[in-house]
């Protein structure tokens, strides 16, 4: 079976796919394709930020190419975002921190 | 129960707290806690390459601050450079595409 | 309401770099937006040059890349352009613009404009 | 590049015509179309984004439609304002690029 972290990789491209399929080019996420990924997928993060203008302003700073679309390199970029607001979250815990073996 | 995606971050950022606070700074990944990493959270990647040279090259592709050392933001470059690798196997598969609903 | 004032020499040598400062005010510089240099020679159209934005990402127009440089400073909500090695058809109005998050990435704020002649 | 070509390069009318810009674009711009106002001697001014939405302030006379690769702007009612020249821009990739201008003049 997979390890945990490989298979963390594969859910990474597999549900950037699962949206990014649905309209226009199969490649990219538009807006309404983020839109669903971050409401279904990312609920804790999204949180109650559901306006237009919060969805706009983080399509903008994903989108570092100006195409109006999020290609899975600006995807990943955006992930690692979050996965280090996560770790410094979890660096603020050291009684949660895994000890030595 | 966490979304995927979710608990795919959760991972990658456990993982490498699992193998940084083994020795050293607790929050960074020396060289053999990188290869422990490695050799046994990411053993598809890695395959056969586990000489010296090979791990001392990639060390320092991922030690962007030159400081001998593997902080969280560089593991996360990491990880994206990775999952673009399999991104890129995965779009070369068209029929392994998720279709439209 | 936001205001940006463009400040720099109005004549620059050919073969030397011309150097360009825009001053945001009326809002904060924050990253919400990309901040744009846009140029009008003389009884001309528009040509985009480039932007810098979030996390001080830079993109600049290819025809113009090899001359170009942009930076900013959050801290005086300033940015600026250098375009080095002008020859006479860089001679134009230069705008500084902010760009939108909305579709499209309008520009929707735009300052006066500064002629700048490239002349020996 | 994405090539913008604006017709007519400039028009004559009066206050209360309807005037009709027109914008083609070299390829498909996905409705990544913006009109911009500029007036002699003057900054531009931003007047409709994404086709067809309407900027901040900017009266409702103004109005945009299109798809694909052709767009317009129209004026419903001139007004003595109104009279400027008029420049479409896509938003659709970098480089950005704009239309060669239509000047408003009065008739």
């Known amino acids: 079976m997979a390890c945990p972290l490989e298979k963390a990789l594969d859910v990474m491209v597999s549900t950037f796919h699962k949206y990014s399929g649905k309209e226009g080019d199969k490649f990219k996420l538009n807006k309404s394709e983020l839109k669903e990924l971050l409401t279904r997928e990312l609920p804790s993060f999204l949180g109650k930020r559901t306006d237009e203008a919060a969805f706009q302003k983080l399509m903008s700073n994903l989108d570092s190419n100006r195409d109006n679309e999020v290609d899975f390199q600006e995807y990943c970029v955006f992930l690692s975002c979050i996965a280090m607001m996560c770790n410094e979250f979890f660096e603020g815990f050291p009684d949660k921190q895994p000890r030595k073996k | 129960m966490a979304c995927p995606l979710e608990k795919a971050l959760d991972v990658m950022v456990s993982t490498f707290h699992k193998y940084s606070g083994k020795e050293g700074d607790k929050f960074k990944l020396n060289k053999s806690e990188l290869k422990e990493l490695l050799t046994r959270e990411l053993p598809s990647f890695l395959g056969k390459r586990t000489d010296e040279a090979a791990f001392q090259k990639l060390m320092s592709n991922l030690d962007s601050n030159r400081d001998n050392e593997v902080d969280f933001q560089e593991y996360c470059v990491f990880l994206s450079c990775i999952a673009m690798m399999c991104n890129e196997f995965f779009e070369g598969f068209p029929d392994k595409q998720p279709r439209k609903k | 309401q936001v205001q940006l004032q463009e400040s720099g020499p109005g004549l620059v040598k050919p073969s030397q770099t011309l150097s360009l400062t825009c001053t945001v005010s009326g809002d904060s510089f924050t990253n919400d937006y990309y901040w744009n240099w846009i140029r009008q020679h003389p009884g001309k159209g528009l040509e985009w040059i480039g932007h810098i934005g979030y996390g001080g990402n830079i993109n600049y127009n290819p025809s113009l890349k090899n001359r170009l440089s942009m930076s900013r400073d959050t801290s005086k909500n300033q940015f600026s352009l250098k375009l080095s090695s002008v020859t006479a058809a860089d001679t134009a109005v230069y705008y500084c613009?902010?760009?939108?998050?909305?579709?499209?990435?309008?520009?929707?704020?735009w300052g006066q404009g500064t002629l700048v002649t490239v002349s020996s | 590049d994405i090539q913008m070509t604006q017709s007519p390069s400039s028009l004559s009318a009066s206050v209360g015509d309807r005037v009709t810009i027109t914008c083609r674009a070299s390829?498909?711009?996905?409705?990544?179309l913006n009109w911009y106002q500029q007036k002699p001697g003057g900054a531009l001014k931003l007047l409709l984004y994404?086709?067809?939405r309407l900027h901040s302030g900017v009266p409702s006379r103004f109005s945009g439609s299109g798809s694909g690769t052709d767009y317009t702007l129209t004026i419903s009612s001139l007004q003595p304002e109104d009279f400027a020249t008029y420049y479409c821009q896509q938003g659709n990739s970098l480089p950005r690029t704009f239309g060669g201008g239509t000047k408003v003049e009065i008739k």
């Open positions: 613009t902010r760009e939108s998050f909305y579709d499209g990435y309008p520009f929707d704020y």
């Open positions: 994404y086709t067809s």
């Open positions: 390829q498909d711009i996905r409705n990544y």
